[in-house]
Interface confidence: medium
């Protein structure tokens, strides 16, 4: 006899990285017929939803209208059908960004290099705790983690034209609180003359779907909706 139901799926829309004071929705998808969903935050009951009618709904949404550091952390959800409860979902790490300060990103030997050269990015932030994240714009949304007291090094090693693209970094105040993004640094890698035109470049999404930051006079550094790889989620594990 089955003791528990299969675990639900949990995710955040538009993204698990949420600029402070912006909205986010935590979604929990279980089974049709579930009469109750519970959202847990850092191990404690956070919210309850009872879908109506349960037989027509298999997903609930928990809306956070105003993200802040107190709401950042690990979420999970469970549901029940009748008296039978599900296994808990995987953990969702909800991260608040645009906290406090802005790091500086630089690249050595420079932003224009030749294929094969060794390139290192440096992310500096006086006030971060010790962890830094380097992100490359694009479909695969590469994320690297680095450590240092006020600066982290990100050695890319000998680069190829596949390393071309736009990079940004964040400083982390803790696992769930990240700084503003640095200003972008565009890395230009020149390959062999005959290969340059055919060099593969990490394909990027349009600006409105990649997690880039737009500079506007109205809001300063503003986070766009993003659908990043779950690589960044895994970094928090």
């Amino acid at each position: 006899q089955q003791q528990t139901l299969p675990k639900p799926f949990i995710w955040a829309e538009p993204h698990f990285m949420v600029p402070k004071e912006k909205q986010v929705t935590i979604c929990c998808q279980g089974n049709y017929g579930a009469v109750e969903y519970q959202l847990h935050f850092e191990g404690s009951l956070f919210a309850v939803d009872r879908p109506k009618p349960p037989e027509r709904i298999n997903k609930v949404q928990f809306y956070i209208p105003d993200m802040n550091s107190r709401m950042a952390g690990q979420y999970s959800c469970i549901y029940r059908v009748g008296e039978l409860w599900s296994e808990p979902s995987n953990l969702l790490d909800l991260v608040v960004t645009e906290m406090y300060d802005t790091p500086t990103l630089s690249v050595h030997p420079g932003p224009e290099v030749i294929s094969g050269e060794k390139v290192t990015f440096y992310c500096r932030l006086d006030t971060a705790t010790s962890m830094f994240l380097l992100l490359k714009e694009g479909r695969s949304s590469h994320v690297q983690r680095g450590y240092g007291k006020v600066q982290a090094e990100f050695p890319l090693g000998p680069v190829t034209t596949a390393h071309r693209g736009t990079y940004r970094c964040f400083g982390s105040y803790n696992n769930h609180a990240w700084s503003f993004p640095s200003e972008p640094v565009k890395l230009l890698v020149t390959g062999d003359i005959e290969n340059t035109s055919l060099a593969p470049e990490d394909p990027t999404f349009p600006a409105d779907t990649w997690g880039t930051y737009l500079l506007t006079t109205e809001t300063g550094l503003q986070k766009d909706h993003a659908l990043w790889d779950h690589t960044a989620q895994n970094l928090l594990r």
Partner: antibody, heavy 120, light 107 residues
Framework: EVQLQQSGPELVKPGASVKMSCKAS????????INWGKQRSGQGLEWIGE????????YYNEKFKAKATLTADKSSNIAYMQLSSLTSEDSAVYFC?????????????WGQGTSVTVSS | DIQMTQTTSSLSASLGDRVTISCRAS??????LNWYQQKPDGTVKLLIY???RLHSGVPSRFSGSGSGTDYSLTINNLEQEDIATYFC?????????FGGGTKLEIK
């Protein structure tokens, strides 16, 4: 609406200490840095230091390290600045200001100032 | 420490005028330059951040420009409510430092 409400004027004797407050409202207190500044009569502003209320981390202007102590009470959304061993040079208006939401080291909301007069 | 210099300590202008206030840093501050307005009652407000970005709620007659070490604040079509002292502040390196201020008066 973001507001920073500072405590009232202080008249203190030389050698004494004073502790002033800055009550924040209209935003999540722990998510923004609070700065403190000094303005002597008819003069410019001097930056004293800043506190990260979420962690209690402080950064001070070297000039004020021995003079000012910054603290914050997360439960009441109040930042404090204590000034010690007061002299006539410390007579000034002291401002608290929130470092802005832009991440670009600008102070977007300011308190109304607390006037401190050091006199025997 | 980075020194911020506002060479003009006071300035007289007529209503409707275009007024420019300048600020010089002792070293390159990479556009981390902010402008504040202090009214006669002591109230301080942020006008411009990061050289040229207008803070929310600030009238569009205020604008900022500059780079490197030299920056300026421009007020177009001066109004009575603009009578105040204007301070620049660098946000490039701690300790954050302010200019001495430029007091704007009506002719």
């Amino acid at each position: 609406e973001v507001q920073l409400q500072q405590s009232g004027p202080e008249l203190v004797k030389p050698g004494a200490s004073v502790k002033m407050s800055c009550k924040a409202s209209g935003y999540t207190f722990t998510d923004y840095v609070i700065n403190w500044g000094k303005q002597r009569s008819g003069q410019g502003l001097e930056w004293i230091g800043e506190i990260y209320p979420g962690s209690g981390t402080n950064y001070y202007n070297e000039k004020f390290k021995a003079k000012a102590t910054l603290t914050a009470d997360k439960s009441s959304n109040i930042a404090y600045m204590q000034l010690s061993s007061l002299t006539s040079e410390d007579s000034a208006v002291y401002f608290c200001a929130r470092r802005g939401r832009y991440g670009l080291y600008a102070m977007d909301y300011w308190g109304q100032g607390t006037s401190v007069t050091v006199s025997s | 420490d980075i020194q911020m210099t506002q060479t003009t300590s006071s300035l007289s202008a007529s209503l409707g005028d275009r007024v420019t206030i300048s600020c010089r840093a002792s070293q390159d501050i990479s556009n981390y330059l902010n402008w504040y307005q202090q009214k006669p009652d002591g109230t301080v407000k942020l006008l411009i951040y990061y050289t040229s970005r207008l803070h929310s709620g600030v009238p569009s007659r205020f604008s900022g420009s500059g780079s490197g070490t030299d920056y300026s604040l421009t007020i177009n079509n001066l109004e009575q409510e603009d009578i105040a002292t204007y301070f620049c502040q660098q946000g490039n390196t701690r300790p954050w430092t302010f200019g001495g201020g430029t007091k704007l008066e009506i002719k």
